[in-house]
């Protein structure tokens, strides 16, 4: 495979990763798939420094990240360990609130207007952030 050594047009480089910030909104699953089509993933926040970087770029707008608990436990989309990793939830979050009247609880995490995290209904059309790592060999699968 080939290694990506610089970020694509319209992406922002930071600490050996590339970030792309949407200016439109989609449901979490559609945002997740959008990132996958870019050979990326929804942003995975692993440090306070990365949190501040993303927060600076998105501003005070609800924005999806690559964290969900749709299958039970909270999981990062790239396999980063949730339990031992960085967290920045709002107080009393996540709460899997059922009172929104939309059916079910809240299974997808997003940045809130102050940057701290909240769980919300995955169908809400929020902005999103894609991330891909530099120097990661892109796996071009063999032809069948």
């Amino acid at each position: 495979g080939s290694e990506r050594t610089c970020c694509p047009v319209n992406w922002v480089e930071h600490e050996r990763s590339c970030y792309w910030f949407s200016r439109s909104g989609k449901a979490w699953a559609d945002a997740d798939n959008y990132c996958r089509l870019e050979d990326a993933h929804l942003v995975v926040v692993t440090s306070w420094e990365e949190q501040k970087f993303v927060q600076h770029h998105i501003g005070p707008v609800n924005t999806w990240m690559g964290l969900h608990d749709q299958n039970g436990p909270w999981k990062w989309v790239d396999g980063t360990d949730y339990e031992t990793g960085f967290k920045n939830w709002r107080p009393e979050q996540p709460d899997d609130w059922y009172g929104h009247g939309l059916g079910g609880g809240e299974d997808c995490a997003h940045f809130t207007d102050d940057g701290r995290w909240n769980d919300d209904v995955c169908q809400r059309p929020y902005r999103w952030v894609c991330e891909t790592e530099l120097d990661k060999a892109s796996q071009e699968p063999p032809l069948l």
Partner: antibody, heavy 122, light 108 residues
Amino acid sequence: EVQLLESGGGLVQPGGSLRLSCAASGFTFSSYAMSWVRQAPGKGLEWVSVLSGSGGSTFYADSVKGRFTISRENSKNTLYLQMSSLRAEDTAVYYCARRGREYSGYDYFDYWGQGTLVTVSS
Amino acid sequence: DIQMTQSPSSLSASIGDRVTITCRASQNISSYLNWYQQKPGKAPKFLIYAASSLHSGVPPRFSGSGSGTDFTLTISSLQPEDFAIYYCQQSYRTPLWTFGQGTKVEIK
């Protein structure tokens, strides 16, 4: 100039297989997700499958899932669609299309090939 | 899947006429709406994205509007080369993209 040229269509019996190819030129092929869209005779357009630029992520319409496989060879600027267990309802012109996108998050099919006809009949 | 419904399915118009085609989505798709033109025996041609943004090289007589579930494609002054089938397509559901059934614009 962006160009997409499909090939590999033809007449095949139900249950048979066929592999379509799409040769791309005029742009950095590996930077774009590529898709197949089909059109049955006298009918509208139906999205079939899409593949990310590296080939690492693939998606399929429910109507072809498990029967069709999309792939690409970036060194040859070529997209493929391997079709198996073909049915009469797969008869269509198959178009290769580039997934364009702009900075806000909107995407679209900005360039299309001329299409290749697949006829499934006994 | 999101269903896209166009109306009318066909229309007859004269050169110079103002033509409007509508497209309705089965659920809110914000502005994730594209328009394509297809002539007989040819591949579709990309016209408009994000409901109202013209693709490069598309004549300004074409315009799009709408958001949510209701959208329109307008040709301000129909030209001979505009007789074709027009399709809308939603790009909200990535990548479960769906098209309208098409609207045929014929010569009166």
